[in-house]
């Protein structure tokens, strides 16, 4: 069950599994919910009536019946991890701390104009896991204006004391904001010999990298494969860091892969979700329970509903034993990982899918594209919406595309004319025109936030943001798509995709089906040759083919240009103008949305 | 046919700079780590630099730590060596290469000739 | 780091002759060695990598063998296009190495 209102003067006796330091109640409760064992938490907020070297104290708890004995104490705080709630949740946290010391190893000490540009050089910073900065009115005048970036083994303070005209906060790379290259890069036959933080268990390279993407020291990692020589370290996952940030060498060994935290992109690749089943092989920890499963998915999903479940094996039936039903093992560890892993066993085994929901949801892999043809079917682009106008009469006016439960992103240009967000709908999961009647549920829109720096298509920040009058329910059919990571700027984009209701030629009509067109994309320098009247400029991307025949048209405008990369779909550009339609050497020309990343957090996170 | 291609070299003061370029086709450039290697005149082969498909990490030879850059557009599939701060041992014949997962350099360019001389 | 010294720094030889040359690791390297070769004002060109292993168009009379430190290239029943500088390359661990080549030289 979901509880998510903290309980004011309450303790939870018991269960205890360790103490960090947080600077506050909610963000004691995202702590326990990221940790792979907490349920439960008590957090002490600072009082006379209780001992400062308790104040800030943030115990994890644990529990078999998921709850335990509340006690009545004044400023204690309790609460539940969010792990039993299916709502999307965030480790992003923006607040900043007035008169609060986080402690922690102080690397580096600067001159800093603000608490803002403090909180950039920690985000910016491989290192850094919060900060404190000493404000111009801190009494010691050497210390003014001075922005100490931290870190810790935990990622959170070591402790927490008041002290007067400083502030703190921390790093925001787990918002989507740091400019810190992302090196998706894995290195097979290469070791990295740095420092181990921390080792766990894991069945393949892509599991080793995400638990180091999500662990707060991890920079960089080395997995030893199942046929690593040594029997002892297979399947051995050595969690990495050094100084610099980078490893110090590489050396080649056979059957080990390496590779790097995606702590800078997280935001648009699965981190906690492990999806994948493991045959032939058993994962061991402690057992929680043993159920009778018909399947290898059916035991996933029980341990999926079961909060504790962390992993499972599942032993397929002998031959008409037990109704067919297999032997389904739910197990836990104190890290997430299992203990050990078997091979040549016989056993199914995976993870939970309950901590898909810490991930963004624009990671959910979707149905196959479908090869071939214009028309899309139903839910192949879940991202795309139709904007109607419903002045003078309803029609469709632009494309979008959902980048969070309350936002559309779309081009500015569509709204010359629109005098109100109340002439406009939103239609989501929609795959022909014909669909919409006027009983059709739409989404109305309560404020169209423009670039401000808009002028017109052709001269650049062709972009705008709907906020939604009400949430989009995340369905197969309706589900954001994510945004290109700032790291990942030198990504090339292979395979991408135009859709939209526009014209198929210049003079032409709405279209009632959605359609697609896989198109590539073409350098800024070939572009610019094929537009000289105009300036291509790094905030714009172009797509065509240079005989022309496939393109955006009138009515794509605010659609999106979707490309895949790691079997996860990127907002790449916003379809913006182009010099008529599909036609030869003149590529669409399209919104650069890497360029517009923190504009977009910077609206859609506002406080 | 896997294709590169230098330019840029040329000759250049003590204490100049040069940018050597590396024009790659034939493959799937953004694929692959690259790296550059250089011969003096008359003399034997010496790593310089390689970098990452990604471009986010790059390693350098003690001899040029500090004073090279490497770094690649993965657009353009070009590759870069920037040279700040040459000396008279600089001089070298330059090579792109491909760095493949048998850590071995599969593929080289021509080389283009720099000569750091007053 | 890992230093690479070849011998002889030149050989003489034969068309037909079997040609053996020879690298050694300052320290072991497992089997983690490649082998080039480079014609005059041409680019080298990789024969060999992991010691024996014949890099994909590379005729079969070029072989390797070796492993820790001592490593060999032996090339059977020489042929003119042959004649050329041979290096030897660690492929243990950065910062990489080269040998200092070996000049094989028309007798």
């Known amino acids: 069950e979901c509880v998510t209102q903290l309980l004011k003067d309450t303790c939870f006796e018991g269960g205890d599994i360790t103490t960090v330091f947080t600077p506050s109640a909610k963000y004691c409760q995202v702590v326990c919910t990221y940790h792979p064992r907490c349920l439960l938490f008590t957090f002490t907020a600072e009082s006379p009536s209780e001992d400062p070297t308790r104040w800030f104290t943030c115990v994890l708890k644990d529990s078999v019946t998921e709850t335990l004995p509340r006690v009545n104490r004044t400023a204690a705080i309790s609460g539940y991890s969010f792990k039993q709630c299916s709502h999307q949740i965030s480790a992003c946290n923006k607040d900043i701390y007035v008169d609060l010391d986080m402690k922690g190893i102080n690397y580096n000490s600067s001159v800093a104009k603000s608490a803002q540009e403090c909180q950039e050089r920690c985000t910016d910073d491989v290192h850094c896991h919060f900060f404190t900065y000493a404000t111009r009115q801190f009494p010691s005048l050497e210390h003014r204006n001075i922005c100490l970036l931290k870190h810790t083994q935990t990622g959170t303070p070591t402790r927490i004391t008041k002290l007067d005209k400083v502030v703190s906060g921390f790093s925001l790379k787990s918002c989507a904001l740091s400019n810190l290259a992302c090196i998706r890069d894995i290195f097979p036959n290469t070791v990295f010999a740095d420092s181990n933080i921390d080792s766990v268990m894991a069945p393949d390279a892509f599991v080793c990298g995400r638990i180091c993407t999500h662990h707060p020291g991890c920079l960089f990692f080395t997995f030893f494969s199942q046929e690593w020589p040594k029997e002892s370290q297979r399947n051995l996952c050595l969690l990495k860091t050094s100084e610099s940030g980078l490893p110090s060498t590489r050396i080649k060994k056979s059957k080990a892969l390496s590779g790097f935290s995606l702590q800078s992109c997280r935001h648009s690749i699965p981190v906690f979700c492990h999806s994948s089943f493991y045959h032939d092989t058993d994962f061991l920890g402690e057992e929680l329970d043993i159920v009778a499963a018909k399947s290898h998915e059916a035991c996933q999903k029980l341990c999926t509903n079961a909060v504790r479940c962390q992993f499972f094996t599942y032993t397929p039936a002998q031959a008409s034993c037990n109704e067919g039903k297999g032997k389904c093992y739910l197990k836990l560890s104190s890290n997430g990982s299992p203990t050990k892993i078997l091979h040549g066993r016989g056993g199914i085994s995976g993870y939970t899918l309950r901590l898909c929901k810490m991930d963004n949801e624009c990671t959910t892999k979707i149905k196959p594209r479908i090869v071939g043809g214009t028309a899309s079917v139903r839910g192949e682009w879940p991202w795309q919406v139709t904007l109607h106008t419903t002045s003078p009469t309803q029609r469709h006016l632009c494309g979008g595309s959902i980048i969070g439960n309350q936002w559309i992103l779309t081009a500015a240009h569509c709204f010359y004319g629109v005098e109100s967000p109340k002439i406009l709908r939103v239609y989501s999961g929609i795959l022909n025109q014909s669909e919409i009647k006027e009983d059709t549920s739409f989404f109305g829109v309560q404020e169209i936030i423009i670039h401000d720096q808009y002028k017109m298509a052709e001269s650049g920040y062709d972009i705008a943001l709907l906020k939604l009058e009400t949430t989009v329910n995340y369905t197969d059919s309706q589900r954001p798509i994510c945004l290109p990571s700032k790291g990942d700027r030198n990504v090339i984009y292979t395979d991408c995709w135009v859709t939209g209701w526009g014209y198929r030629k210049l003079r032409d009509k709405i279209q009632n089906t959605l359609q697609k067109a896989k198109i590539p994309l073409v350098t800024n320098e070939e572009c610019q040759k094929r537009y000289r009247g105009h300036k291509i400029t790094h905030k714009m991307i172009c797509a065509g083919y240079r005989e022309g025949g496939k393109d955006a048209c009138k009515g794509d405008s605010g659609g999106p240009l979707s490309c895949k990369h790691n079997e996860v779909w990127h907002l790449v550009g916003i379809t913006s103008w182009g010099e008529g339609c599909a036609q030869r050497e003149r590529p669409g020309v399209y919104t650069n949305v890497v360029e517009y990343v923190d504009w977009i957090l910077e609206k859609t996170q506002a406080v | 046919e896997v294709q590169l291609l230098e330019s840029g070299g040329g000759l250049v003061q003590p204490g100049g700079s040069l940018r050597l370029s590396c024009a790659a086709s034939g493959f799937t450039f953004s694929d692959y780590e690259m790296a550059w290697v250089r011969q003096a005149p008359g003399k034997g082969l010496e790593w310089v630099s390689s970098?990452?498909?990604?471009?986010?990490?790059?390693l350098y030879a003690d001899s040029v730590k500090g004073r090279f850059t490497i770094s690649r557009d993965n657009s353009k599939n070009t590759l870069y060596l920037q040279m700040n701060s040459l000396r008279a041992e600089d001089t070298a014949v330059y090579y792109c290469?491909?760095?493949?997962?048998?850590?071995?350099?599969?593929?080289w360019g021509q080389g283009t000739l720099v000569t750091v001389s007053s | 780091d890992i230093q690479m010294t070849q011998s002889p720094s030149s050989v003489s030889a034969s068309v037909g002759d079997r040609v053996t040359i020879t690298c050694r690791a300052s320290q072991g390297i497992s089997s983690w060695l490649a082998w080039y070769q480079q014609r005059p004002g041409k680019a080298p060109k990789l024969l060999i990598y992991d010691a024996s292993s014949l890099q994909s168009g590379v005729p079969s009379r070029f072989s390797g063998s070796g492993s820790g430190t001592d490593f060999t290239l032996t090339i059977n029943s020489l042929q003119p296009e042959n004649f050329a500088t041979y290096y030897c390359q660690q492929a243990d661990s950065f910062p990489i190495a080269f040998g200092q080549g070996t000049r094989l030289e028309i007798k």
């Open positions: 290469a491909t760095w493949g997962d048998s850590w071995g350099f599969d593929f």
């Open positions: 970098i990452v498909p990604s471009g986010g990490w790059t």
